[in-house]
Interface confidence: medium
């Protein structure tokens, strides 16, 4: 099966790598613009230069292209706790990330939020915090995991999932109560 190619890919595949087919004259292959620049005017003829102009401030192209406009620089989403790791240049988009001791949770492919890495107080670090994953904690005896923190079993209510983890403590408490009443 031959993969379906879009018009632009079809046109580009006629020319050697690094060139594209002239939109008005398919017998001419023009040289693509370098990253950091965009196409201002197509080459007038074979072997003649493509008119490429540098991207203006606030825009970029990250690879060779024949785009009529540069791409707008991304802005880091402060509401999501993001910080700027490196600013936008003519040939590279803004790089956004999280602060130290935080990890990224991706809600979707293009949307991430920064959250604090859990410290595992009253427990041990099972897996360290990573760029895209929170710390995995294992709680000490007498504690259960709630909001990714190890909480004392004395805070365990019967309706919560913790009852399974804290069952021995609950039974012990019940046992001492029962022994006092019999």
């Amino acid at each position: 099966l031959v993969p379906h190619l879009g018009d632009r890919e079809k046109r580009d595949s006629v020319c050697p790598q690094g060139k594209y087919i002239h939109p008005q004259n398919n017998s001419i292959c023009c040289t693509k613009c370098h990253k950091g620049t965009y196409l201002y005017n197509d080459c007038p003829g074979p072997g003649q230069d493509t008119d490429c102009r540098e991207c203006e401030s606030g825009s970029f192209t990250a690879s060779e292209n024949h785009l009529r406009h540069c791409l707008s620089c991304s802005k880091c989403r402060k509401e999501m706790g993001q910080v700027e790791i490196s600013s936008c240049t003519v040939d590279r988009d803004t790089v956004c990330g999280c602060r130290k001791n935080q990890y990224r949770h991706y809600w979707s492919e293009n949307l991430f939020q920064c959250f604090n890495c859990s410290l595992c107080l009253n427990g041990t670090v099972h897996l360290s915090c990573q760029e895209k994953q929170n710390t995995v904690c294992t709680c000490h005896a007498g504690f259960f995991l709630r909001e990714n923190e190890c909480v004392s079993c004395s805070n365990c209510k019967k309706s919560l999932e913790c009852t399974k983890l804290c069952l021995p403590q609950i039974e012990n408490v019940k046992g001492t109560e029962d022994s006092g009443t019999t």
Partner: nanobody, 120 residues
Framework: EVQLLESGGGLVQPGGSLRLSCAAS????????MGWLRQAPGKGLEWVSF????????WYEDPVKGRFTISRDNSKNTLYLQMNSLRAEDTAVYYC?????????????WGQGTQVTVSS
């Protein structure tokens, strides 16, 4: 004490609409991302939608995209979920949740839930 009180659920025919509300108290509402989870009969909890603390960014799980809209009114400490073009598979208990500083898999505070039943 953190409290989240959902309302607006009910019985609705396929193709119908409902608007869920969640009144929040006991914490600084505008400092937290919020979300809606749901639990269908015999299934686990799943995230339906999320909204950041100021309402600029939202996310929806694929089955509800284009049909559900999450919003918030920080002046009223209230979270909303507008549900349109409802389907039988949307039948579930819907919970409002405060997303903790440790992430969406570490939510601890959620309401008692509101039942949504989609049936003809």
């Amino acid at each position: 004490e953190v409290q989240l009180l959902e309302s607006g659920g009910g019985l609705v025919q396929p193709g119908g609409s409902l608007r869920l509300s969640c009144a929040a108290s006991g914490f600084t509402f505008n400092r937290y991302s919020m979300g809606w989870l749901r639990q269908a009969p015999g299934k686990g909890l799943e995230w339906v939608s999320f909204i950041d603390k100021v309402g600029h960014h939202t996310w929806y799980e694929d089955p509800v995209k284009g049909r559900f809209t999450i919003s918030r009114d920080n002046s009223k400490n209230t979270l909303y979920l507008q549900m349109n073009s409802l389907r039988a598979e949307d039948t579930a208990v819907y919970y409002c949740a405060k997303i903790s500083q440790f992430g969406p898999n570490a939510f601890d505070y959620w309401g008692q839930g509101t039942q949504v039943t989609v049936s003809s």
